[in-house]
C-alpha cells in the first residue's frame, strides 16, 4: 500500500505564439482544479478506461480575475498535493491522466460552471520511494509543470511497496536473513508470511496468509503449471494429474467491489464498474457531487433528484458512460458506405473512400465512365469506382479494342464444332444435338426436348447465336 | 417520453392483500432506483418504499408506517415495478404513485387502493 | 425521522414574485437532501418540477428556479402566472428514504 503525490507547479501559457486568452475575465471570474487519474501499466487507452489505480482531485484555487489587456499569466493554483492511496502493490509503471479544470464563478443559473481547460497524458517508470520526479506537459498553447513520486505506507517498502518493515526487536541488529529497511534504519525487513506451502518459486503475497500466482502458475499454492490443453472449467484446465488447473478463486469472488459497484475479470486482475456516485479501484471513494467535477471530457455536470443520480453528466459529442469516460466508437455504427475507412479523430468522423466515391460519408458514386470511351461500339458500365466496358459480339479487352476469337472459350457443348462468325460464333452440332450451343438432346424419336423446333430448322442443322 | 403506468388498484378488506404493477418505457430501467409514493384522500404526499438497481444488490427501504407489511420488487427483463401490500389497514386508503427520481421527478398517473370493510 | 416542514398557503398576484421554503427538522438543507419540487394540480396531476436542487424539468416555464436559501429549500416563480396556482410540495432525501413537506397551497388572485 502506498500513495502516489503530485504536486503542481505551474499552469500557463506554453512558450511560442499563440498566447491563450485567459480564462477568467472581470465579468467572468474563476478559479482552477485538478483532476488526476491513474492506471497501472503503459496503458494506451487515455480517456476512456477506468481509473484503476485511482483518481484524485484537488481542492479549488484562489479565485482569479483577469487584468484587462494583461496576457494570461501563470494561474494561481490550488494548495496542497494531489493524493491517490493505492491499495496493492505499486506497478513501476502507469499512465496518468492530469486535467486542469475551470470552475465559473458567474452568476450562472443553478450555481457554477465547469469547463475542462486541458488534458495532458503520459506514461511513465517510477519505483516507489524515489525521489520527486518533475516532468513539463503541453497541451494546445498550455504548459502544466508538475512533480510527481511514489511512496509507500508503513509498513510497507521497496519500489513496489511489498516488502514490510517492522520496528527492531533487538536493540543492534537485525534477525537472521533480514535486512535493515533502508532508508529507516532502525527497522528490520519483516519476514511476510505468506500461506503455509505457497511456492516460493511460483508464488508470492502481498499481505500475510495470502499465496499469489505468478503468470503461467495456479492452485491455491501456485503449483500447478497453466496447461494450454483444452479442459473444461471456466478459468481453465480441471485437474492436476492432466496438468489442467483446478480453478481457483477468481479474482471477483466475493464481489471486491464496494458501494454496489459490479466486478468483471480482467487478464490479470479485476476491474470494478462504479455506480454514479462512486469510483476508484473498488468504488471506495463516494459522497461525489457536481463540485467534485466528476464529468470528464468536458461533460456537463447537473444535481441529480435522489442518491443514486447524486450528479448528472451531460456528455458531449463522442463520449458517453455515467462520467463522459468512455469515447464513444463511432465507426463501430460503419457509417462509411461503399467500403469507405472510417476514422474517429476525436471531434470529428472521417471516411476515408474507395477510388470512385466521394462525400463525408462515402455516399456519391464517381462518374467511373466519365471521358472514357469504349471502342467498337462498348457501352461503359460503372462499378466500384472502376469502369469496365461491356463489348460488342466479336471485341474484347479493358475498352472493347481487341478482336475477340468467339470460339476460344469453346462454347459448342457435346462435341459440336465452332465457327466464328461476322455476327458472333455459329455451332455445328455434333448428331443426337441441337440448339443455339448444342445444349439439347434429341430425343430417340425424332421429338426434342425443346418445345418446338424453329421453322425452317432441323434438329441437327448448324444454329447460329446471335 | 417516459411513461410510468400503475395498474392493481381496487377494493380490498381490511387484512387483505394486494399487489401493485408498474409498467415503465422509454428510459433504462434497470439503471435506476424505484420509488412508491402515496396520497391519502384530501392529505399529502407520503414516500412508501424505494428499491435500488441490480448493481446496489435491489437493496429496498420502507417508511415506518409500512414495514413489515409491504414489499417492493422489481423485473427488469420486463422493465415492471411492484408493490406486494399485505395486512392492509384503512388508513392505506390511498392513490399509488410509482415514481422515479433522476434529473427531477417523473410521476404515473396513479392507481386508487380502497381499503374498507 | 425528519420532519419537513412548508408553508401552508401563500398567496400572490399575476407577475409577481413569489418564494416557497422548505426546512428540515435535522438542520440545514444540503445538496445531499436532493431537494425536489413537485406541483399538484386537480385531479391528482402531479408535475416534477425542479429536481437535485435546481435541474427545471423540460416544459417547466423558466420563472420556476430552485434553489437553497440560508439553511432552507426553496422553490421561486418570478412573475407569477395564474395557471401556477396549485399545491407545491418539496421533498428532502435523508440518506434512503424521501420526506415530503406538507405541501403550499399557492393563490394567484
Known amino acids: 500500500a502506498g500513495v502516489f503525490e503530485l504536486q503542481i507547479h505551474s499552469f500557463g501559457p506554453g512558450p511560442g505564439p499563440g498566447a491563450p486568452r485567459s480564462p477568467c475575465s472581470a465579468r467572468l471570474p474563476c478559479r482552477l482544479f485538478f483532476r488526476v487519474c491513474l492506471k497501472p501499466g503503459l496503458s494506451e487507452e487515455a480517456a476512456e478506461s477506468p481509473c484503476a489505480l485511482g483518481a484524485a482531485l484537488s481542492a479549488r484555487g484562489p479565485v482569479y480575475t483577469e487584468q484587462p489587456g494583461a496576457p494570461a499569466p501563470d494561474l494561481p493554483l490550488p494548495d496542497g498535493l494531489l493524493q491517490v492511496p493505492f491499495r496493492d502493490a505499486w506497478p513501476g509503471t502507469f499512465s496518468f491522466i492530469i486535467e486542469t479544470w475551470r470552475e465559473e464563478l458567474g452568476d450562472q443559473i443553478g450555481g457554477p460552471a465547469w469547463s475542462l481547460l486541458a488534458r495532458v497524458a503520459g506514461r511513465r517508470r517510477l519505483a516507489a520511494g524515489g525521489p520527486w520526479a518533475r516532468d513539463i506537459q503541453r497541451a494546445g498553447a498550455w504548459e502544466l509543470r508538475f512533480s510527481y513520486r511514489a511512496r509507500c505506507e508503513p509498513p510497507a517498502v521497496g519500489t513496489a511497496c511489498t516488502r514490510l518493515c517492522r520496528p527492531r526487536s533487538a536493540p543492534s541488529r537485525c534477525g537472521p536473513g533480514l535486512r535493515p529497511c533502508a532508508p529507516l534504519e532502525d527497522e528490520c525487513e519483516a519476514p511476510l508470511v505468506c500461506r503455509a506451502g505457497c511456492s516460493p518459486e511460483h508464488g508470492f503475497c502481498e499481505q500475510p496468509g495470502e499465496c499469489r500466482c505468478l503468470e503461467g502458475w495456479t492452485g491455491p499454492l501456485c503449483t500447478v503449471p497453466v496447461s494450454t490443453s483444452s479442459c473444461l472449467s471456466p478459468r481453465g484446465p480441471s485437474s492436476a494429474t492432466t496438468g489442467c488447473l483446478v480453478p481457483g478463486p477468481g479474482p471477483c469472488d466475493g464481489n471486491p467491489c464496494a458501494n454496489g459497484g459490479s466486478c468483471s475479470e480482467t487478464p490479470r486482475s479485476f476491474e470494478c464498474t462504479c455506480p454514479r456516485g462512486f469510483y476508484g479501484l473498488r468504488c471506495e471513494v463516494s459522497g461525489v457531487t457536481c463540485a467534485d467535477g466528476p464529468c470528464f471530457n468536458g461533460g456537463l455536470c447537473v444535481g441529480g433528484a435522489d442518491p443514486d443520480s447524486a450528479y448528472i453528466c451531460h456528455c458531449p459529442p463522442g463520449f458517453q458512460g455515467s462520467n463522459c469516460e468512455k469515447r464513444v466508437d463511432r465507426c463501430s455504427l460503419q457509417p462509411c458506405r461503399n467500403g469507405g475507412l472510417c476514422l474517429d479523430l476525436g471531434h470529428a468522423l472521417r471516411c476515408r473512400c474507395r477510388a470512385g466515391f466521394a462525400g463525408p460519408r462515402c455516399e456519391h458514386d464517381l462518374d467511373d465512365c466519365a471521358g472514357r470511351a469504349c471502342a467498337n461500339g462498348g457501352t461503359c458500365v460503372e462499378g466500384g469506382g472502376a469502369h469496365r466496358c461491356s463489348c460488342a459480339l466479336g471485341f474484347g479487352g479493358r475498352d472493347c479494342r481487341e478482336r475477340a476469337d468467339p470460339c476460344a472459350a469453346r462454347p459448342c457443348a457435346h462435341g459440336g464444332r465452332c465457327y466464328a462468325h461476322f455476327s458472333g460464333l455459329v455451332c455445328a452440332c455434333a448428331p443426337g444435338y441441337m440448339g443455339a450451343r448444342c445444349e439439347f438432346p434429341v430425343h430417340p424419336d425424332g421429338a426434342s426436348a425443346l418445345p418446338a423446333a424453329p421453322p425452317g430448322l432441323r434438329p441437327g442443322d448448324p444454329q447460329r447465336y446471335l | 417520453e417516459v411513461q410510468l403506468v400503475e395498474t392493481g388498484g381496487g377494493l380490498v378488506q381490511p387484512k387483505g392483500s394486494l399487489k401493485l404493477s408498474c409498467a415503465v418505457s422509454?428510459?433504462?430501467?434497470?439503471?435506476?432506483?424505484m420509488n412508491w409514493v402515496r396520497q391519502a384522500p384530501g392529505k399529502g404526499l407520503e414516500w412508501v418504499a424505494r428499491?435500488?438497481?441490480?448493481?446496489?444488490?435491489?437493496?429496498?427501504y420502507y417508511a415506518d408506517s409500512v414495514k413489515d407489511r409491504f414489499t417492493i420488487s422489481r423485473d427488469d427483463s420486463q422493465s415492471m415495478l411492484y408493490l406486494q401490500m399485505n395486512n392492509l389497514k384503512i388508513e392505506d386508503t390511498a392513490m399509488y404513485y410509482c415514481?422515479?427520481?433522476?434529473?427531477?421527478?417523473?410521476w404515473g398517473q396513479g392507481t386508487l387502493v380502497t381499503v374498507s370493510a | 425521522q425528519a420532519v419537513v416542514t412548508q408553508e401552508s398557503a401563500l398567496t400572490t398576484s399575476p407577475g409577481e414574485t413569489v418564494t416557497l421554503t422548505c426546512r428540515s427538522s435535522t438542520g440545514a438543507v444540503t445538496t445531499s437532501n436532493y431537494h425536489n419540487w413537485i406541483q399538484e394540480k386537480p385531479d391528482h396531476l402531479f408535475t416534477g418540477l425542479i429536481g437535485?436542487?435546481?435541474n427545471r424539468a423540460p416544459g417547466v416555464p423558466a420563472r420556476f428556479s430552485g434553489s437553497l436559501i440560508g439553511d432552507k429549500a426553496a422553490l421561486t416563480i418570478t412573475g407569477a402566472q395564474t395557471e401556477d396556482e396549485a399545491i407545491y410540495f418539496c421533498g428532502l432525501w435523508y440518506s434512503n428514504h424521501l420526506v415530503f413537506g406538507g405541501g403550499t397551497k399557492l393563490t394567484v388572485l
Open positions: 415514481v422515479f427520481y433522476y434529473d427531477y421527478v417523473y
Open positions: 428499491i435500488r438497481n441490480k448493481s446496489n444488490n435491489y437493496a429496498t
Open positions: 437535485g436542487t435546481n
Open positions: 422509454a428510459f433504462t430501467f434497470t439503471t435506476y432506483a
